[in-house]
């Protein structure tokens, strides 16, 4: 299936909105920096069939959506930006869902590499644990915002590679 051009625009919009959501200087939070162990190898796109790559992308975006839909998140960010960001994520989830339904068709392509999905989930569990340990402080959220910008950039690159495969 073709991921629509609007999908990549949505990606860019999501990244721009996430950048705009920053409230405090990243430099004032250097002491809170943390390595969350982003599973880069799951986003290089080489070892996947397309449906599996879409499933990993969906997992990444769904977990991001979950993270930014919590009450703690609502308290941390400016509401209109948060809502616009969440709307972009939701639209991407819809695009990916429609795409994978076409992709698997009746040929019954495997839908996932379970290890990849679990790697993404564990990554988000580490982020959630970090926020809990830091008591959802402004600096903790800033570190997480910067981390999600980085991981969404990896997702964007994988989506570009998928489009080149079409």
């Amino acid at each position: 299936c073709d991921l629509p051009q609007t999908h990549s625009l949505g990606n860019r919009r999501a990244l721009i909105l996430l950048a705009q959501m920053g409230r405090i200087s990243h430099f004032s939070c250097l002491k809170d920096r943390h390595d969350f162990g982003f599973p880069e190898e799951e986003f290089d796109g080489h070892q996947f069939q397309k449906a599996q790559a879409i499933s990993v992308l969906h997992e990444m975006i769904q977990q991001t959506f979950n993270l930014f839909s919590t009450e703690d998140s609502s308290a941390a960010w400016e509401q209109s930006l948060l809502e616009k960001f969440s709307t972009e994520l939701y639209q991407q989830l819809n695009d990916l869902e429609a795409c994978v339904i076409q992709e698997v068709g009746v040929e019954e392509t495997p839908l996932m590499n379970e290890d990849s999905i679990l790697a993404v989930r564990k990554y988000f569990q580490r982020i959630t644990l970090y926020l809990t340990e830091k008591k959802y402080s402004p600096c903790a959220w800033e570190v997480v915002r910067a981390e999600i910008m980085r991981s969404l950039s990896f997702s964007t690159n994988l989506q570009k590679r998928l489009r080149r495969k079409d």
């Epitope: 969906h58 997992e59 819809n94 379970e114």
Partner: antibody, heavy 126, light 110 residues
Framework: EVQLLESGAEVKRPGSSVRVSCRAS????????ISWVRQAPGQGLEWMGR????????NYAQNFRGRITITADKSPLTAYLELSSLRFEDTAVYYC???????????????????WGQGSLVTVSS | EIVLTQSPGTLSLSPGEGATLSCRAS???????LTWYQQKPGQSPRLLIY???SRATGVPDRFSGGGSGTDFTLTISRLEPEDFAVFYC???????????FGQGTKVEIK
Amino acid sequence: EVQLLESGAEVKRPGSSVRVSCRASGDTFSSYPISWVRQAPGQGLEWMGRILPALGVTNYAQNFRGRITITADKSPLTAYLELSSLRFEDTAVYYCASPSADIIPSILGTTLFAFWGQGSLVTVSS
Amino acid sequence: EIVLTQSPGTLSLSPGEGATLSCRASQNVSRHYLTWYQQKPGQSPRLLIYGGSSRATGVPDRFSGGGSGTDFTLTISRLEPEDFAVFYCQSYHSPPPVYTFGQGTKVEIK
């Protein structure tokens, strides 16, 4: 684990409206849709529509468009079903249902109903 | 819109016997988007099988799902007394999201 608790039974007149609520507790996410599914006495299951509480986005089954409104509150996470212009054939048990965030991969999560409310009986009678 | 037709309408069997329930779609459905539920009298439905063949948490391994294209099956290898119920298949399609249920198969004690 998610628990879904629906409001009590209702008796309504034809032509009137009914509002059923569904309160979610446990490992809930407002980023997953909550659906409404109904079951007429002795009949099968029929999906009516769903809402994504995080954004208030709704999708309705063709059969109910124009008569159905689904809304939600994020805190506490609660979904509401309003059905208007009630007819005798709307007599049914109304269930709210939600997916599971534990389903792997998440792209399958929203395609199914892992958790169900206990059901709310709506009787339309003159 | 997809129509799911389940057969037989009723299956009369004894505990210990095997059961095969059929769900036929009016057009192709990916097995990934085919789900089975069990409903006992006076209870809410319970998720059994998703993704065509994955058992939900706590579902015994005597339940299995299979099939592809337009023909899907739910197999119960050895019926236990607690298995007698109505079973529904359900498919999903998007966009827009549409959930479709079969009319159900009742498995009753002979």
